[in-house]
Amino acid sequence: LPKAPVITTPLETVDALVEEVATFMCAVESYPQPEISWTRNKILIKLFDTRYSIRENGQLLTILSVEDSDDGIYCCTANNGVGGAVESCGALQVKMKPKITRPPINVKIIEGLKAVLPCTTMGNPKPSVSWIKGDSPLRENSRIAVLESGSLRIHNVQKEDAGQYRCVAKNSLGTAYSKVVKLEVEVFARILRAPESHNVTFGSFVTLHCTATGIPVPTITWIENGNAVSSGSIQESVKDRVIDSRLQLFITKPGLYTCIATNKHGEKFSTAKAAATISIAEWSKPQKDNKGYCAQYRGEVCNAVLAKDALVFLNTSYADPEEAQELLVHTAWNELKVVSPVCRPAAEALLCNHIFQECSPGVVPTPIPICREYCLAVKELFCAKEWLVMEEKTHRGLYRSEMHLLSVPECSKLPSMHWDPTACARLPHLDYNKENLKTFPPMTSSKPSVDIPNLPSSSSSSFSVSPTYSMT
């Protein structure tokens, strides 16, 4: 006799692990044999879907390899045309070992900001997430919290928060660990010890001291009156993320010295500044005609002639003393290209030492003129012919510019070392002895003011004149 379908074994909830097999059984008694269809979340499962196997006249539905997306309500419906269709439903719960779907990544963060290390997980049952810092479980506090999502949030990041982190996802089926990531805490550059201001005497040595810290360790640069420091020696040392910079200066003029500590955070820089003033005692004293200051020679023309690191007098009656005095020498040197090999080095030494006069120590900078004897040696011994020609040209007005006249000293207006050996500067490049003076032109005056005594020999000489040269 025909019999309406009856589901004798209703569907039950099935627990299945990912990639395992899950089977629903829908046992039906009926006559004639019913047609059985299956749905998942009310969507018909097609018979030809290769992910499923439907056997025993449709009474067995097997999911061949469970995926987490297979979760849902599965129903079987039986119908044989006799009476109404019958349905039974059951849930598939996909059980899953913990899986970290969005692992944490290395983070660089500036101290004081908020850091979030992500750790998004999957798993059924829902995994619990904890964090490890270094080798120890991370304890939550008012600043550090593990969010519902599993991410680690650190408010007001501190230097001590830096280190290696990993997240751990755990459920009843297993545990998953993320790879170890690094939290780097960067700290804005900060000056720990600012340079101190000094009031010193002209020609003193001063060491300015600047200490800074930061992560990464900052670099320190020194600025003098708004420009990069041009002279002085800088010594640096780094220890425990602290950089110590010492600028040693030879003080020849007042200045504002700024220590700038800089470090880089991604594409941005952080800087910290501290300044010190160097004032010179009695610097403001009126200087009348000898207005100027002393500084190390930074030009090119006189490099080989002037003593290394020597201080020279820069005359502030020029708008740009260094440039103006360099131009004076340059103009004069061009005239020297045609002079004899005996005259040229002597004349170069004279010009450079006359235009860039040596500085003497004291309360205010004062230039030291060349000794008359050395000037006369150049004029009447080394460059006798050339000097006559030059004087003749000057008298006849053959020079296009008057500039060269400023370059050539008037020997008679220079102090003699005979009367005061400390009143004037020697030219170390002129190295000759009394016997070399046998070719010296005869003197028209017996006064000591034009006498050339034996000039002191110099170990730093660049040339010497021997008696074999004829000066006539």
Partner: antibody, heavy 115, light 113 residues
Framework: EVQLVESGGGLVQPGGSLSLSCVAS????????MNWVRQAPGKGLEWLSV???????YYADSVKGRFTISRDNVKNTLYLQLNNLKPEDTALYYC?????????WGQGTQVTVSS | DIVMTQSPSSVTASAGERVTINCRSS????????????LNWYQQRLGQSPRLLIY???ARESGVPDRFSGSGSTTNFTLTISSFQPEDAAVYYC?????????FGSGTRLEIK
Amino acid sequence: EVQLVESGGGLVQPGGSLSLSCVASGFTFSLYYMNWVRQAPGKGLEWLSVIDTHSIAYYADSVKGRFTISRDNVKNTLYLQLNNLKPEDTALYYCVLGRTALVRWGQGTQVTVSS
Amino acid sequence: DIVMTQSPSSVTASAGERVTINCRSSQSVLYSSNQKNYLNWYQQRLGQSPRLLIYWASARESGVPDRFSGSGSTTNFTLTISSFQPEDAAVYYCQQSYKPPYGFGSGTRLEIK
């Protein structure tokens, strides 16, 4: 030969003034720094003042504000004006040629401050 | 101000003897720009004006016998008479000329034995 001849010394009462002169010869006076140095009876040397070729002057603290150094390059003469004299200013006053060393010395002129 | 300290205050020597006089400055008198020490030595014989012997710590003034020599650097200096002669009996002074005021030492009296 360099000659430095001081004059103008003498006996003066405390609070009084004197003007010392030093006439230079034998060298181009205007090109050199000049100094005054004194020596109290039986005592050591005391540097007082220097004047450079541009007439910029420096003084020892003991005489600053009371003594004034000056020069006349036309007359080849160095001066020291002594004001508000005290008994401790009693000394032989030397005129000396020299920039950073006291190279040539005069014979000195005696200043006595006494009531 | 730079203070100059001389020692000893007095010394006696026989002819031919080596004599040294010391001078110390309270701060450096070495000028780094030219590496010169701005330290001078003077001799003052009884009843005479002082006479420059040594400038720049070691440069002998012209006419000064070569038995006189100066040495030292920065703050410590020495005047040496290699072979004392009777005419060397005098008071010797050191003086700094690094910066004004150019102070003298208190002097060392050198007498013949």
